[in-house]
Interface confidence: low
């Protein structure tokens, strides 16, 4: 459980696997809470201890039971790892110390008015860890309101030192305050050069850019897949840094993947920890524990709740299992992350939850933010689900919109493949918002399957839907994460706040527009819907939106994309733009799929094809 | 410019210890993964080991393995090859080599420096 | 390990001459080939590298081709300064390996 806790006056012995300078106790925790094996630390204020080496001294400690023994020592103040504390992790540390020099690598100096500004200087530089600035009183004149932006190996000072007139603190890049802005793109078969700070092994290459976001040095990776042609290098998640701060080349190279630091991202960072299951995928390390549990997600539960378990691996062996439950292994490692990583196995593998910060992962996203004709503009991340399908042949094009529905999976309307259903051919971007920010190296996703609904006619606009699996699974951003989908059979709800989004034209004979539109339509009965189609028959399984006297609609370039409604605070994927008799006429509703008529086709598919649900469902 | 400049080699016994030496200058070492490559006399080209920028990712060919360790000072912008248990056929020129990204092009190399393993 | 069979092993030919050299792979290695030139007493240059792209600094009668298995060096015209051993290396897989050299001599 969550221990917070501190003892004054105490020092924990034994038990060392890291130390180093943090100006105070609250620092030193936190650098015990990302630490991998540190469950307890000890921390000697520049008044405990005379030994100038030894002053602000933070110990990070590991023990088997999960205690140490705690002796007297004026002063020192000793604590626990926040694992397992929710909310009140994170590395953000905010706090300015008076009458404190901390020492790291100088790499940049400058004159500014107050220490507030030096740490805004600090954080808006991708380098920089922490600051000292000498104030107006500082004993040397030519030194005065210097702002000295400063580095090092570990991201902590190399050394403190108590020296009056000078304040220092910490870059609040990890509170998401950074003005910088972060590349969220994952670029396929790209390997970044430059200094290599660590190398780790991931089973992907999201959780390898979220190792390198809490690395301290780390400002970009290349992760080589599994598949990569050199066996020993197969799931390495190297972690890189260069002077510039940025890659100076990147090379196209088959198998790999890479990506930047997501910690100059502005209002939210990625959670410190992974929370997806990979099956067939054993995780080799220092075994911790063996328990037979029921099921990997069990596992999962289990290895969170042990405090030192960094991941698991669940075997699904005959010989691992008895009546339903099987072998739950439990392990460990110096770096916390495997030690090797084996494919094709009966296991499936994950990592402890411990440093999560929501509790569940599993919730549907439930964002607040509010041509698609008589649209407005769309924000970054206001619409994360939505995805453009576009087509590559001689020339590249937006062809229809789509939802994403889970890490591979993405939702759309059966008639977006019309003549179409080659799957090299298209191209799936998520988490963009302007479509002309696409060039040849925007990262984009394949497909792996087309399931058009066994039902879909291409001259009728019945069952008009269609699932796309995706070659490779999406990791969740800010900009690019799932829709919730609606329960099965939905009818009871009354939805008031329904919006359309996409690219598609502003007027019936228009273009593709370059933002994001969206179009706020409120819901039309399905009575209401038939009169205004008399000449079609509008079944139970569509759902239409519109204004009587028109103007916002969907239109040629929507298809697919989605109609969502805001209940009780989250978003719900309540219909597929579909069809319409023109754009935005009067009278004349736009059509959508209803999603929620489709619930049991959607998991059937999902399953069969995966062995697992993979959607955002609010149940 | 690109130098690279290896120091080291001699007359060694069999079951001998040598320690060859690479100063980079005129790039940043610390970024490149660098390798070592020998020449038989009159014989062709062989890839003996590999090093990453951080030190902490080295690969070598089966001939060396268990006998030769890849190393590298990035603040003293050295490479160097520490060769043991030397046998009649490591006797060759040893070149100091630059791999350039990840196409594991060799760009630019040492002059060599001969190795002569003989009692 | 991955084999690279060059051949011919030498070659004589005349300053002017069209020299082609070929290189195979014992198995797929796509385009992660490179070729280096070798003259007695010094150390390899880089000539080409990815198959088929031209290494900085190096003139464009040298051209590379080829992709899988079998690749190519080609000497559109042989200068004096030419005659040397030439040596084809992959960076598919570890280890990496060489090719066992052709040297043009001249005729």
């Known amino acids: 459980g969550c221990l917070t806790q501190l003892y004054e006056n105490a020092f924990f012995r034994g038990g060392d696997v890291a130390s180093m300078y943090t100006p105070n106790a609250q620092y030193c925790q936190m650098r015990c809470t990302f630490h991998p094996r540190c469950l307890l630390f000890s921390f000697l204020p520049a008044s405990s201890i005379n030994d100038m080496e030894k002053r602000f001294g933070c110990f990070l400690k590991d023990s088997v039971t999960g205690t140490l023994p705690k002796v007297h020592r004026t002063g020192a103040v000793s604590g626990h790892s926040l694992k397992q504390c929710g909310h009140q992790i994170s590395a953000c540390h905010r706090d300015i110390y008076k009458g404190v020099d901390m020492r790291g690598v100088n790499f940049n100096v400058s004159k500014v008015s107050s220490v507030e500004e030096c740490q805004k200087r600090c954080t808006s530089n991708i380098r920089c860890q922490f600051f000292s600035y000498a104030t107006q009183t500082f004993h040397k004149a030519e030194y005065r309101n210097n702002c000295l932006l400063k580095y090092s190996p570990g991201g902590t000072p190399t050394a403190i030192k108590v020296l009056s007139n000078v304040e220092s603190g910490f870059s609040l890049k990890p509170c998401a305050l950074s003005e910088i802005g972060c590349h969220m793109n994952i670029f396929q078969h790209l390997a970044f050069s430059d200094v290599d700070v660590a190398r780790v092994l991931t089973p992907d290459a999201f959780v390898c850019r979220t190792i390198c976001t809490y690395h301290p040095n780390c400002l970009f990776f290349t992760f080589y897949t599994n598949v990569w042609k050199i066996e020993s290098q197969r799931n390495v998640c190297l972690l890189k840094t260069s002077e510039s701060g940025t890659p100076s080349s990147s090379t196209p190279q088959e198998n790999t993947i890479s990506g930047y630091s997501l910690l100059t991202c502005k209002r939210t960072l990625p959670e410190p920890c992974h929370s997806k299951i990979y099956p067939g995928v054993d995780f080799g390390g220092e075994e911790l524990n063996v328990t037979f549990v029921k099921g990997v997600n069990v596992c999962q539960e289990t290895c969170t709740k042990m405090i030192r378990c960094q991941f698991f691996t669940y075997s699904l062996l005959p010989e691992d299992c008895k009546e339903e439950k099987c072998k739950c292994f439990l392990r460990l490692s110096m770096d916390g992350s495997p030690t090797r990583i084996a494919y094709g196995t009966q296991g499936s593998s994950g990592y402890s939850l411990r440093l999560c910060n929501t509790g569940d992962n599993s919730v549907c996203t439930t964002k607040t933010s509010t041509r698609i004709v008589g649209g407005t503009n769309s924000s970054w991340g206001e619409w994360p689900w939505q995805v453009s399908l576009q087509v590559k042949l001689t020339a590249q094009r937006h062809l229809c919109g789509g939802s994403l529905i889970g890490h591979q999976w993405v939702l759309t309307a059966a008639h977006c493949f019309d003549g179409l259903p080659l799957q090299d051919v298209w191209r799936i971007y998520s988490g963009i918002l302007n479509l002309s920010d696409i060039t040849k190296d925007t990262p984009f996703s394949q497909i792996k399957e087309i399931i058009i609904h066994q039902n879909y006619k291409v001259s009728e606009g019945n069952h008009d839907i269609a699932l796309i699996k995706l070659q490779a699974p999406l990791n969740y951003t800010e900009f690019q994460k799932p829709i919730c989908l609606p329960s099965k059979g939905d009818t009871s709800t009354i939805y008031t706040n329904c919006w359309v989004t996409g690219w598609g034209f502003s007027k019936e004979k228009g273009e593709i527009q370059n933002i994001l539109q969206k179009v706020n339509i409120p819901l039309v009965t399905n009575e209401e819907c038939q009169k205004r189609y008399q000449d079609y028959k509008i079944t139970q399984r569509m759902v239409c939106a519109g204004y009587k006297e028109g103007g916002k609609d969907a239109c040629k370039g929507d298809s697919g994309g989605p109609l969502v409604c805001k209940h009780n605070g989250m978003w719900r994927l309540v219909g597929i733009t579909s069809w319409g008799e023109g754009c935005a006429r009067r009278e004349q509703p736009g059509v959508y799929t209803k999603v929620a008529e489709y619930m049991d086709w959607i998991l059937e598919k999902t399953q069969s094809s995966d062995g697992k649900a993979q959607m955002q469902s609010p149940a | 410019e690109v130098q690279l400049l290896e120091s080291g080699g001699g007359l060694v016994q069999p079951g001998g210890s040598l320690r060859l030496s690479c100063a980079a200058s005129?790039?940043?070492?610390?970024?490149?993964?660098m390798l070592w490559v020998r020449q038989a006399p009159g014989k062709g080209l062989e890839w003996v080991s590999s090093?990453?920028?951080?030190?902490?990712?080295?690969m070598y060919a089966d001939s060396v393995k268990g006998r030769f360790t890849i190393s590298r000072d990035n603040s003293k912008n050295t490479l160097y090859l520490q060769m043991n248990s030397l046998r009649a056929e490591d006797t060759a020129v040893y070149y100091c080599?630059?791999?350039?990204?990840?196409?594991?092009?060799?760009?630019?190399w040492g002059q060599g420096t001969l190795v002569t393993v003989s009692s | 390990d991955i084999q690279m069979t060059q051949s011919p092993s030498s070659l004589s030919a005349s300053v002017g001459d069209r020299v082609t050299i070929t290189c195979r792979a014992s198995?797929?290695?796509?385009?992660?080939l490179n070729w280096y030139q070798q003259k007695p007493g010094k150390a390899p240059k880089l000539l080409i590298y990815?198959?088929?792209s031209l290494q900085s600094g190096v003139p464009s009668r040298f051209s590379g081709s080829g992709s899988g298995t079998d690749f190519t060096l080609t000497i559109s015209s042989l200068q004096p300064e030419d005659f040397a051993t030439y040596y084809c290396?992959?960076?598919?897989?570890?280890?990496?390996?060489f090719g066992g050299g052709t040297k043009v001599e001249i005729k």
């Open positions: 005129g790039f940043t070492f610390s970024y490149y993964t």
């Open positions: 090093i990453y920028p951080s030190g902490g990712f080295t």
């Open positions: 198995q797929s290695i796509s385009s992660y």
């Open positions: 990815a198959a088929s």
């Open positions: 080599a630059r791999v350039d990204t990840a196409m594991a092009m060799i760009d630019y």
């Open positions: 290396q992959q960076s598919y897989s570890t280890p990496i390996t």
